[in-house]
Interface confidence: low
Amino acid sequence: AITEAREEAKPYPLFPGPFPGSLQTDHTPLLSLPHASGYQPALMFSPTQPGRPHTGNVAIPQVTSVESKPLPPLAFKHTVGHIILSEHKGVKFNCSISVPNIYQDTTISWWKDGKELLGAHHAITQFYPDDEVTAIIASFSITSVQRSDNGSYICKMKINNEEIVSDPIYIEVQGLPHFTKQPESMNVTRNTAFNLTCQAVGPPEPVNIFWVQNSSRVNEQPEKSPSVLTVPGLTEMAVFSCEAHNDKGLTVSKGVQINIKAIPSPPTEVSIRNSTAHSILISWVPGFDGYSPFRNCSIQVKEADPLSNGSVMIFNTSALPHLYQIKQLQALANYSIGVSCMNEIGWSAVSPWILASTTEGAPSVAPLNVTVFLNESSDNVDIRWMKPPTKQQDGELVGYRISHVWQSAGISKELLEEVGQNGSRARISVQVHNATCTVRIAAVTRGGVGPFSDPVKIFIPAHGWVDYAPSSTPAPGNADPVLII
């Protein structure tokens, strides 16, 4: 295509010979600026046509000769006004003007649609001097026209600060239809209407559109471009394209696939990323989305224990990030887990179920009914309790941890004891007399130490007291009891 610029063109000298009125009287060009590419254009339009000079934009010279005879007005001669040709053909057109020899130099420039065209590879200026005038022919050629070369071309010449403008030469490049809008692939709901758009331009106009669905024409009569095809609905995938026709022939658009949205395929590769006593972190690979974005996923969890009631827990989450931490599970339990995801059409089937187990955890409750009493005869404190409920042990019980704190005037001493899992009683030696002993007990599994029971306090008197009754875990609301027997 033609390069456009806004720079000044360098003027060609009007008389490249030694002096005006050179001996060269024939009509061979005195100076010819050759076409760089050296080809012979396919179309050539003659420089001049017989008839009156163009009078649209003329310059009337102020200079007079010796006889004071006024010079004629200057104007470009008429030339061809409209050139129609096919894409990729060559074209050459020109404008000509006769200029009195009194003008020492001048410039002819070519303009397209209001912008100056630069590039010597397009333009040749030839000079034919005579006694009084020099004929100037400016030719413009394009080797292989494109649609972008369409437009209005003019010559301009500056003389005496006057601008002379030629009649326009309209170039119309014709070719096969050119798409400005093609149908786009879409994902649509089954049996729901949708539109496809196709637009193509010439020249030549008009451009007519035929629609094609799965290789068969949809419309018997063509529609003028642009065309909107309303498809009332599809039940299965289809490929659409459009044909654009003009006098030069036919262009076919790309074929676009229209997919029918469906429920997604079930997720695959559900896997366990991490297990704790009360949670399982799972991930999955989403199945095919059914041509509609995933919105949510549902994680279904059921106890794998054959004695369980078979109820299913459901956890909903967003489709991203294909990762979910299932919480509030029991420790040391087996679960079956499945995942299903949804798009706007509906839910997928559930993925293949996988088995997962929670690990052992620390017990979630403390031992119950803690009772403490003093056995003076052996100078021991006896402690009794009840096991936490099996369900809340969160693992296999390996023992108990007993904290006993001894406090008397100015002294505080805490000791920890570990006892085996079989018993539900322990005996500890009195550490300090005339002191308060505070006892708390926690259950222990391989998963860790559970919470400690509420403190139970007993006063250990000085030697010589007679009888001792037990202290127990206080009833709710009785804070911090100290039983002195």
Epitope: E184, D289, P293, R295, L320, P321, E344
Partner: antibody
Framework: QVQLQQSGPELVKPGASVKLSCKAS????????INWVKQRPGQGLEWIGW????????KYKEKFKGKATLTVDTSSSTAYMELHSLTSEDSAVYFC?????????????WGQGTTLTVSS | EIVLTQSPTTMATSPGEKITITCSAS???????LHWYQQKPGFSPKLLIY???NLASGVPDRFSGSGSGTSYSLTIGTMEAEDVATYYC?????????FGAGTKLELK
Amino acid sequence: QVQLQQSGPELVKPGASVKLSCKASGYTFTSYDINWVKQRPGQGLEWIGWIYPRDGYTKYKEKFKGKATLTVDTSSSTAYMELHSLTSEDSAVYFCARGFYSNLYYFDYWGQGTTLTVSS
Amino acid sequence: EIVLTQSPTTMATSPGEKITITCSASSSISSNYLHWYQQKPGFSPKLLIYRTSNLASGVPDRFSGSGSGTSYSLTIGTMEAEDVATYYCQQGRSIPLTFGAGTKLELK
């Protein structure tokens, strides 16, 4: 071709609210999420949240819950983000971006950004 | 949230150099979820590479990406002046979606 055209720059006072817009063209608006991303001057990119135009489903980064409200008008293929109780910390360029949802979330087209200046 | 750490923060380069930017994730992500963006001064970010190694439309093949697990990298085979920009990695694995802090490439 796909384009996201965002509204012009905003100068607002602290404590006020502002509503930014993002007009989509060149694709089916209801088929892709619109995300919003914040960029403080000279800083990196921070995801605010997304909205799915078909059903208005939203997802926010925790820190923007209550600060940003995402909405859409499907009839004009326009997404909006309203920012509330503005402070100087909210001065930033806000981008809208189309989320390519193929189980591996990325942003394939971006708006040109809206500059928000919060100043008294 | 997954934190993405980019290095270096800034880099002065010359045309023709080979450039490598790294992005480290705080936890392992599949390579499907790591993407790269280019942001030139005064412009919005542009998708450069998606799914670790796939070039987005119109991106010159001097750009490439690789990595797995927690470690990813973006390479410019031969630096050109037009590549001066800030580059961000982004993960799509976990909500919130997060970006690296960016690597700024400058010319010496």
